[in-house]
Each structure stands twice: as structure tokens, then as C-alpha cells.
């Protein structure tokens, strides 16, 4: 029998029952937070011998083996994982082993013991039979090994039954418990599994099997199960099913996920039945299984419960991530915040269409609209009193809407409405007329010209560059003289620059009024000279990279028919000159026969310009006369060469601190000082524990269901 | 707190027709899958038909496919059951139910686990 879809028993041990007929757990086996110590020898599943996502145990009081509840427990598939653990035990305060002696393969996905005080028998399992990668394994804090004294089958009678095999260059026997030895199969399966018999199954099988080469004798599938046979893929008008099993199409046309609250139902695509088109896929109409590539970004509809959604933090607008199309109305209220413009695109940037209204009010944080960089709609479903769709209030230190030679935006019904913006000139405002269609809607009074636009500079001369020099890491730039009509009001240059890998930057990017800014800026006072035209040497930079860089002259606040006057120039972009490449990474050597060797390597992380070819050279090395010191066919006398890891056992460390012998006359002396890589990375472990802990503590912990 | 209330229930020939109506409070129901299931006297509850809340994709039960048709009006908070060519077979007790949460994993559409909220039914009999 399938089980499933995920089995989470705890509180109450009798719960156990529910694995009763199991033959399959597709999903996860959690058994955690029984704190009643129970008898669990009446409680054996034998039946069970695949869990196809991940096993959890936490803080199970009375258990002391797992071996008697799951006997015939093979393979864990990991299709899913915890934290990236396929096996997870946690604080199990009385479990003396594991003991899932028929444990075979943990198909994807790494372990994590941590914090059981009495168990032990882990040093005497080699996980390299089980896992293919061990590095990832987190074996800490359970009860250390020398108060163990792990005995494996038959070794106190001197007639050791378990097979050996070298873990961290030491050699020894490999067993679950002290009557259960660890599985090896013959090197002659390679990687097949094979018989208690040791012989080998099937290909397609994974695990163990209960007949050899048969593919309908396999405990487990290495690759797919269908109608009683694994197969190396799902046959025609079969689909792939939680990375395991082929259903047919009536069984994913009628599923639903429990995970959601609606019906949306399961997908088929790329011969594999799923909870949801995979990214850059859409359903094909709404009764449709299958799925089509969106054209640029997915569609996402979000919907906001009060119609009104008011962003007035970077956590409010968090809520529209990947939103497309926004239903109902944005009210926008932005009055402070860190590295705002960049977050709200974050979150916000994907947004096409928004039904109803958008209201921009007291946003002072705001510098620029072009953080909702894809808005083409405004439907004006809905409209504020007044019939007004786009409402822009008080906005102190707003300086653009968009980049209009850049962007199309239509508001389909409404008004526009703009008061108290005293940095966004009226120009700008017009232009927004004619760009979204809504020229001739508003009244006299919906654009108020005398308190928009008063604090800035609106009528803008251009600044013209005269010339630009570069060099592989600098760049000389200079530009016309700017002469205002009163000389004395021109005080000073500021120049902007950045990197810009594409030639679409605007002046606003990443720019909001507590201090982002995305431009690097330098002032640049006047020459004194009247004749010698402003310029500026940027240094530091990167070579053959793209900068985009502008001038703006800074005035005094000049009124001349209501408006000040300003000069800046087109934004303009300039690479630096090519220069050497950083060294190729990764080289690696390896020779595939007697007068051959074969070299790999990567390219640089900075190439500084376009690579056209690599120098490659060699020169031979005297051969190292340690190998012929020793007689390589006495097999125990093959010296193990031991290399310095770069940590230190801290058990050892605090149990006898002078135990280092320095050499010559000086005797015993301490322990060498942590260097700050050691106490980095005991800092780092410290910090993912906790992270891995409160991510187990949020994940089981929940509100009892309704 | 989430009301269901089914109606449009009565008595019908064979081959007739009848609309049921199951009007939803205290939830947002745009949000929200649907379905129908019926319970005949002596039997067990089974599923009729079911409807996703963002798309509209629909799902009907052998024995009714090709003579129901669910369909839902979110701006009136209803979902509708429209029952053509009525059998016999069709009597019985039709309960609203909505979806919820529940857990991990997957359910078939006809699963009562996967639904939270439920009316009090409308009984439909079919009889000439």
C-alpha cells in the first residue's frame, strides 16, 4: 500500500498504527514530540521499506533503536528534503543506535545526527555505501565514541562477522548494532544491490531485491515503478509521479494539492505530472493539463483581500513579489527606509497592470516612479472621489515619474491628479499626458502648476562633453563651460558615474532620498580660467568595463518666470581599455597515459577584455624519491601519509592542554591559539546550528488544524 | 466565521432539470476552491463536482459528466450546480463544501479530507 502524502505522527505513540500496511511512505515520515516514555517493541512495521521524501525523528522519549519499527526500511529517496537532509535525528534522548540495518541508499540528500545523548554506533556505519557524497553530512554532538566502545557482531569472540572497510584511512568492521552487521554487496555488482544472498539484482533495481536480474524482484526502483516492474523511464501516455512512479493522465487529472486552498489541479508537462507549470510555463487556458512558455515574464494575478493595498515598507510590498497583474488599488506611502528604490523594484517591478487606481502620497523617501518598471495599465476600475485613477500627493523629494522615451503607460478611465510636489516639474507631468492618453481629461485645478516643481530646476540647457580619454582603469572626461545668464549663480559640477554593462540606465536608478544611490558622484569645482573648459580624471576604475557617467551644473536657486534654471547632460557611456587577465582558476592535471598529460582549467574571473588564447607551459620535475622507499607488494607496510587538516579536536584540546611537544630542549608547551580562520568557522558552525534548529522548530510547530 | 448555505433542492421527474445555489459568508471566496458532493440514503458520501477559484477549472464525477455543469460567481459569493437530464439515481442529500489547507502532498478532487468548511445540504429527489 501507498501511503502518504507525507505521515506526521506525533503527541501520541498508538499514532504509530497509521504505518501499519505501509509499503511506501510517498512524502515524509515524521515521528517527534512524544514526550511519554513508551514500550515500542509491540510496534513493528515490516512492511516499509520506502520513504520517498525524508525520515524525521525528534524528541521521541522512550525509543532506543530504530531497527524494530522499520526493519525492512531500504531506501530513503530524498525527492524532497529537510533543510537538505534526507535523515534527520534530532535530540532523540534515548536512542542508543539507529540500527536500520536494511538501509541501503539515501537516493538524494545528505544526514543530519545531532544532539542524541545516548547514541551511539555511528562511527561503525560507512554512509559512503548508503550516500553517494558524504561531505555534506552533519554527525555532531551525540555521545562521544570512546564512551561508546561500539562492538560489532562477533568480534569479542574473535570471529568477526561483519565486513571491513576504510573510513578517514582507518580500516575496520561496519555494523548498525551489536547483532546487525552493514550490508556490503560484491564488488563484481558494481553498483548494482544485490540478494541477502549476494547476488546481484536487476539494473533498475535499488537497494535490494528478493530475486536476482529481475526487474519485478526489486525492493525499491533505481529509476521509476510501473504496474509491478521498474523501468529506466515511464512508458508512452504514463507520466512521472513525486519522482518515483508512472500514473496515467485520469489519475493527475484528478488530484489536487493540499497545500493550497484551491482546485487548481495538476499539470503535465515534460512527461512528468506536477503540482504547477515550472517557471517560465503557464497553464494553456483554464481547463487545460498542460503547459505553454509565457512570453516574457510569467503571469501572476494577485488579488488584495480590502481592494486597497497600502505599501508603505519594504515588508508591505514583499506581499507583491512576481505579481504581474495587481487587482484592486496601490497606495503608495513611502516616508522613509534603507535602499528603498532598489527593494520596491525587487518587489514591485514585475508589475503590469494594476485594475484599479494608484495613489502616491507623502512618499518623501520617493525620488522617481522607475521602480515600477514594467506598469504599461491602469485600468481605473476604480477610481478615488473626484474620478481621478493616478493621484499623486506631497511627494517632497520626487524628481521623475518614468523615463517617457523609454516606457509606454495607458490609464484606460480616469484623471490624473498632482499637487505639492515641489522637486517633479510641471514638463514632466505633461508629458505624462501624452503619453498615457489622458490629455484633455483633467480640470485646470488637477495640475497645480504653482506648487509643483517650484524647488527644482525645470528649464534644463544641455551640457555638451568636448572629450574623453581613457586608459585601462581611468577615464578623462570634460564638457562645455556652462554660462547662465548671471554667471555668479553657476557654482559648481557634479559628475555621476557607474558601472552600466547595457546602455539603459536612467538617472534615477536605484536613487531614493535617504541616501541610495546607485551613481557614484564627484564634485567638480569651476576652473578658475574662464577659458579652460570643466574635466574630471575618474580613477580606480575597472579595465574593459562599460561606465556610464553625466554632469549636472549645480546653480543657485535662480527663479526666472516661476522656475529655476539648471543644465545637465545626456548620460554617456564609456569603456575603459582591455589589460591583463587574473590567473585561469581551477587548473587541473591529470596524465591518461605514459607521455601524455591532459590540463583543464577555467577561465579568469576578471578577463579585463575579449580572451583570444591561453599560454600554456610545463617543464619536468626531478621524481620524488619517496616513492621507491618502500616495497609497495608488502601490502602492511605501505606507509599512510597523513596530511594536517587545519582543525583541532577540541575534546582533545581541553582534555590535556600540554600535550605538544615543540621540538628539541622546550618541552611540553600549550595548545596553539585558535587562528581567526578556525574561530570564523566555529562561529559559522555555531550560527548554522541555530539556523538549522529554528528552521526544525518552525517547520513542526504549528497551529492545530481548524 | 464561514457559513454555507445550499438551496434550490425539491422534487423532479426523471430527465428534469434543477439549479442549486450555495451562497458563502465569512471567507473570501474568490480565493477558494469548490466543490458538490451528495450522500444517497444507506451510502456513502461521495463526489460530484469540483471548481478552482483563480481559473475556473472544473471537475465532474463519470456517473454525471455531460449532465451537470458547476459553475461559480465570485462577486455574488455563490457557487451553482446546474443538474440536466436527472436520474434516479441521482437522489440524495447535495452538500456545498470549500476548500481548505491539509497538510503535504496531494488528494483526489472527490476526497472529503481535502475540504474544511461544509453546508447542511439540500435534499434533491428524482422520482416520477
Known amino acids: 500500500e501507498i501511503c502518504g502524502p507525507g505521515i506526521d505522527i506525533r503527541n501520541d505513540y498508538q499514532q504509530l498504527k497509521r504505518l501499519e500496511n505501509c509499503t511506501v511512505i510517498e512524502g515524509y515520515l515524521h515521528i517527534l514530540l512524544i514526550s511519554k516514555a513508551e514500550d515500542y517493541r509491540s510496534y513493528r512495521f515490516p512492511k516499509l521499506t520506502v520513504i520517498t521524501e525524508y525520515l524525521l525523528l525528534f524528541r521521541v522519549a522512550g525509543l532506543e533503536s530504530l531497527g524494530d519499527l522499520f526493519p525492512n526500511l531500504t531506501v530513503i529517496r530524498g525527492w524532497k528534503l529537510f533543510y537538505n537532509y534526507a535523515l534527520v535525528i534530532f535530540e532523540m534522548t534515548n536512542l542508543k543506535d539507529i540500527g536500520l540495518y536494511n538501509l541501503r541508499n539515501i537516493t538524494r540528500g545528505a544526514i543530519r545526527i545531532e544532539k542524541n545523548a545516548d547514541l551511539c554506533y555511528l562511527s561503525t556505519v560507512d554512509w559512503s555505501l548508503i550516500l553517494d557524497a558524504v561531505s555534506n553530512n552533519y554527525i555532531v554532538g551525540n555521545k562521544p565514541p570512546k564512551e561508546c566502545g561500539d562492538l560489532c557482531p562477533g568480534t569479542m569472540e574473535e570471529k568477526p562477522m561483519c565486513e571491513k572497510t576504510t573510513i578517514n584511512n582507518e580500516y575496520n568492521y561496519r555494523c548498525w548494532t551489536t547483532n546487525r552487521c552493514q550490508k556490503m554487496c560484491p564488488s563484481t555488482c558494481g553498483k548494482r544491490a544485490c540478494t541477502e544472498n549476494n547476488e546481484c539484482c536487476h539494473p533498475e533495481c535499488l537497494g535490494s531485491c528478493s530475486a536476482p536480474d529481475n526487474d519485478t524482484a526489486c525492493v525499491a526502483c533505481r529509476h521509476y515503478y510501473y504496474a509491478g516492474v521498474c523501468v529506466p523511464a515511464c512508458p508512452p501516455n504514463t507520466y512521472r509521479f513525486e519522482g518515483w512512479r508512472c500514473v496515467d493522465r485520469d489519475f493527475c487529472a484528478n488530484i489536487l494539492s493540499a497545500e493550497s486552498s484551491d482546485s487548481e489541479g495538476f499539470v503535465i508537462h515534460d512527461g512528468e505530472c506536477m503540482q504547477e507549470c515550472p517557471s517560465g510555463f503557464i497553464r494553456n487556458g483554464s481547463q487545460s493539463m498542460y503547459c505553454i512558455p509565457c512570453e516574457g515574464p510569467c503571469p501572476k494575478v494577485c488579488e488584495e483581500e480590502k481592494k486597497t493595498k497600502t505599501i508603505d515598507s519594504v515588508t508591505s510590498a514583499q506581499m507583491l513579489q512576481g505579481c504581474t497583474i495587481f487587482k484592486g488599488n496601490l497606495l503608495i506611502n513611502i516616508r522613509r527606509g534603507n535602499n528603498i528604490a532598489s527593494e520596491l523594484e525587487n518587489f514591485m517591478g514585475l508589475i503590469e497592470v494594476v485594475t484599479g487606481y494608484v495613489k502616491i502620497r507623502h512618499s518623501h523617501a520617493l525620488v522617481s516612479l522607475s521602480f515600477l518598471k514594467n506598469l504599461r495599465l491602469i485600468l481605473g476600475e476604480e477610481q478615488l472621489e473626484g474620478n481621478y485613477s493616478f493621484y499623486v500627493l506631497d511627494n517632497q523629494n520626487l524628481q521623475q515619474l518614468w523615463d517617457w522615451d523609454h516606457r509606454n503607460l495607458t490609464i484606460k478611465a480616469g484623471k490624473m491628479y498632482f499637487a505639492f510636489n515641489p522637486k517633479l516639474c510641471v514638463s514632466e507631468i505633461y508629458r505624462m499626458e501624452e503619453v498615457t492618453g489622458t490629455k484633455g481629461r483633467q480640470s485646470k485645478g488637477d495640475i497645480n502648476t504653482r506648487n509643483n516643481g517650484e524647488r527644482a530646476s525645470c528649464e534644463s540647457d544641455v551640457l555638451h562633453f568636448t572629450s574623453t580619454t581613457t586608459s585601462k582603469n581611468r577615464i578623462i572626461i570634460t564638457w562645455h563651460r556652462y554660462r547662465p545668464p548671471d554667471y555668479r549663480d553657476l557654482i559648481s559640477f557634479t559628475v555621476y558615474y557607474k558601472e552600466a554593462p547595457f546602455k539603459n540606465v536612467t538617472e534615477y536608478d536605484g536613487q531614493d532620498a535617504c541616501g541610495s544611490n546607485s551613481w557614484n558622484m564627484v564634485d567638480v569645482d569651476l576652473p578658475p580660467n574662464k577659458d579652460v573648459e570643466p574635466g574630471i580624471l575618474l580613477h580606480g576604475l575597472k579595465p574593459w568595463t562599460q561606465y556610464a557617467v553625466y554632469v549636472k551644473a549645480v546653480t543657485l536657486t535662480m527663479v526666472e518666470n516661476d522656475h529655476i534654471r539648471g543644465a545637465k547632460s545626456e548620460i554617456l557611456y564609456i569603456r575603459t581599455n582591455a589589460s591583463v587577465p587574473s590567473i585561469p582558476l581551477d587548473v587541473l592535471s591529470a596524465s591518461n597515459s605514459s607521455s601524455q598529460l591532459i590540463v583543464k582549467w577555467n577561465p579568469p574571473s576578471l578577463p579585463n577584455g575579449n580572451l583570444s588564447y591561453y599560454i600554456v607551459r610545463w617543464q619536468r620535475q626531478p621524481q620524488d624519491g619517496y616513492l621507491y622507499r618502500h616495497n609497495y607488494c608488502s601490502k602492511d607496510k605501505i606507509p599512510i601519509r597523513k596530511y594536517a587538516d587545519g582543525t583541532i579536536d577540541i575534546e582533545e584540546v581541553t582534555e590535556n592542554p600540554k600535550t605538544e611537544v615543540c621540538g628539541g630542549e622546550k618541552g611540553p608547551c600549550c595548545a596553539c591559539p585558535k587562528t581567526e580562520a578556525e574561530k570564523q568557522a566555529e562561529k559559522e558552525e555555531a550560527e548554522y546550528r541555530k539556523v538549522f534548529e529554528n528552521f526544525l522548530h518552525n517547520s513542526i510547530f504549528v497551529p492545530r488544524p481548524e | 466565521e464561514v457559513q454555507l448555505v445550499e438551496s434550490g433542492g425539491g422534487l423532479v421527474q426523471p430527465g428534469g432539470s434543477l439549479r442549486l445555489s450555495c451562497t458563502a459568508s465569512?471567507?473570501?471566496?474568490?480565493?477558494?476552491?469548490m466543490a458538490w458532493f451528495r450522500q444517497a440514503p444507506g451510502k456513502e458520501r461521495e463526489g460530484v463536482s469540483a471548481i478552482s477559484a483563480s481559473s475556473g477549472r472544473t471537475y465532474y464525477a463519470d456517473s454525471v459528466k455531460g449532465r451537470f455543469t458547476i459553475s461559480r460567481d465570485n462577486s455574488k459569493n455563490t457557487l451553482y450546480l446546474q443538474m440536466d437530464a436527472l436520474r434516479a439515481e441521482d437522489t440524495a442529500v447535495y452538500y456545498c463544501a470549500v476548500r481548505s489547507k491539509n497538510g503535504a502532498g496531494y488528494g483526489f478532487w472527490y476526497e472529503a479530507r481535502l475540504y474544511g468548511y461544509w453546508g447542511q445540504g439540500t435534499l434533491v429527489t428524482v422520482s416520477s
Open positions: 465569512g471567507l473570501t471566496f474568490g480565493t477558494f476552491g
